[in-house]
């Protein structure tokens, strides 16, 4: 398997409850918006062929492209949550800039893709389920990357 | 075929500590959570918590923590729950199940091992 | 805390169609699985994903979701179908694996 090098973040960033009950509300407003249930985003299938010592690396592309082209352009909606949960998930992305995979990546980087068509396939629909989903987004950040 | 192998029954005094095995086989064992479950007539199921196989990283439901202790052996594939200070109401079923995420659906499961916490 | 409701019991005629039930308090965005467990046995799994059947799963189980309801349906019940049925969900703030209290199903 390739290696990955610096795909590690302290447990503190999921240790802390007010930003943790607001990313948990945020996505909790956006589900009520989200009217697709039969489509998931984060799921099995992302994590299908992915190693464990991968998945970190396969979560920070996720979380890259859930905030540059999700959170970022519908950032005026959800209030108050979406205003303290971006930069917290910013941070987050910033803290796994370094994180790389030595070796062939190709097939995270498929895993990631059809996430992404999904979204943009459904449109708004499909960033407002990704908005839905950030529980499931924070979960899978904290258990590949502590 | 993939399976996990559970030890067997055990019958335990109050107080006494017990360490329930699960031998993984048929898949990449670093590759999947593996949980423990107890099941008990008044109770039903109970979720206890996982073991992370690759890094040994757990984490436990809040009614465990500080008591319960998952462990694993990568070089035979077999992960360990380990209940110190038995108490008659933990005579249960320990059920062993993996998941791919840690939040998951249990795809397998383990056959069960009785543990029985009698004077 | 989640909590999940099933119905003790629900019986069923050979042939006909078993409707079981799984009710859960803020169960919008968490994901329902079902599992069965027959006598002396582990539990499998059934139905994952609200509606995701695994492989080797006849036809036969599907499974639903409505606002905060859960369904598991089994058509054409058969004798071997006769056990107990679970509902499951990950409360994810609570960082909690959760069951239902189980429905036995009978077949008449």
């Known amino acids: 398997a390739p290696i990955s090098s610096h795909c590690r973040l302290d447990k503190s960033n999921f240790q802390q409850p007010y930003i943790t009950n607001r990313t948990f509300m945020l996505a909790k407003e956006a589900s009520l918006a989200d009217n697709n249930t039969d489509v998931r985003l984060i799921g099995e299938k992302l994590f299908h062929g992915v190693s464990m010592s991968e998945r970190c690396y396969l979560m920070k592309q996720v979380l890259n492209f859930t905030l540059e082209e999700v959170l970022f352009p519908q950032s005026d909606r959800f209030q108050p949550y979406m205003q303290e949960v971006v930069p917290f998930l910013a941070r987050l992305s910033n803290r796994l800039s370094t994180c790389h995979i030595e070796g062939d990546d190709l097939h995270i980087q498929r895993n990631v893709q059809k996430l992404k068509d999904t979204v943009k396939k459904l449109g708004e629909s499909g960033e407002i389920k990704a908005i839905g989903e950030l529980d499931l987004l924070f979960m899978s950040l904290r258990n590949a990357c502590i | 075929e993939v399976q996990l192998v559970q030890s067997g029954a055990e019958v335990k005094k109050p107080g006494a500590s017990v360490k329930v095995s699960c031998q993984a086989s048929?898949?990449?064992?670093?590759?999947?959570?593996i949980h423990w479950v107890r099941q008990t007539p008044g109770q039903g199921f109970e979720w206890m918590g996982w073991?992370?196989?690759?890094?040994?990283?757990?984490r436990y439901a809040q009614k465990f923590q500080g008591w319960v202790t998952m462990t694993r052996d990568m070089s035979n594939t077999t992960a360990y729950m380990e209940l110190p200070r038995l108490r008659d109401d933990d005579t249960a079923v320990y059920y062993c199940a993996r998941d791919l995420t840690g939040f998951d659906p249990f795809d397998i499961w383990g056959q069960g091992t009785l543990v029985t916490v009698s004077s | 805390q989640s909590v999940l409701t099933q119905p003790p019991s629900v019986s069923v005629a050979p042939g006909k169609t078993a409707t079981i039930t799984c009710g859960g308090n803020n169960f919008r965005n968490k994901r329902v699985h079902w599992y069965q467990q027959r006598p002396g046995q582990a539990p499998v799994l059934v139905i994952y994903?609200?509606?995701d059947r695994p492989s080797g799963i006849p036809e036969r189980f599907s499974g639903s979701r409505s606002g905060n309801t859960a369904t598991l349906t089994i058509s054409r019940v058969e004798a071997g179908d006769e056990a107990d049925f679970y509902c499951?969900?990950?409360?994810?703030?609570?960082?909690?694996?959760?069951f239902g209290g189980g429905t036995k199903l009978t077949v008449l």
């Open positions: 994903y609200d509606s």
């Open positions: 048929g898949y990449t064992f670093s590759d999947y959570y």
């Open positions: 073991v992370n196989p690759d890094t040994g990283g757990t």
């Open positions: 499951q969900v990950w409360d994810l703030f609570n960082d909690n694996g959760v």
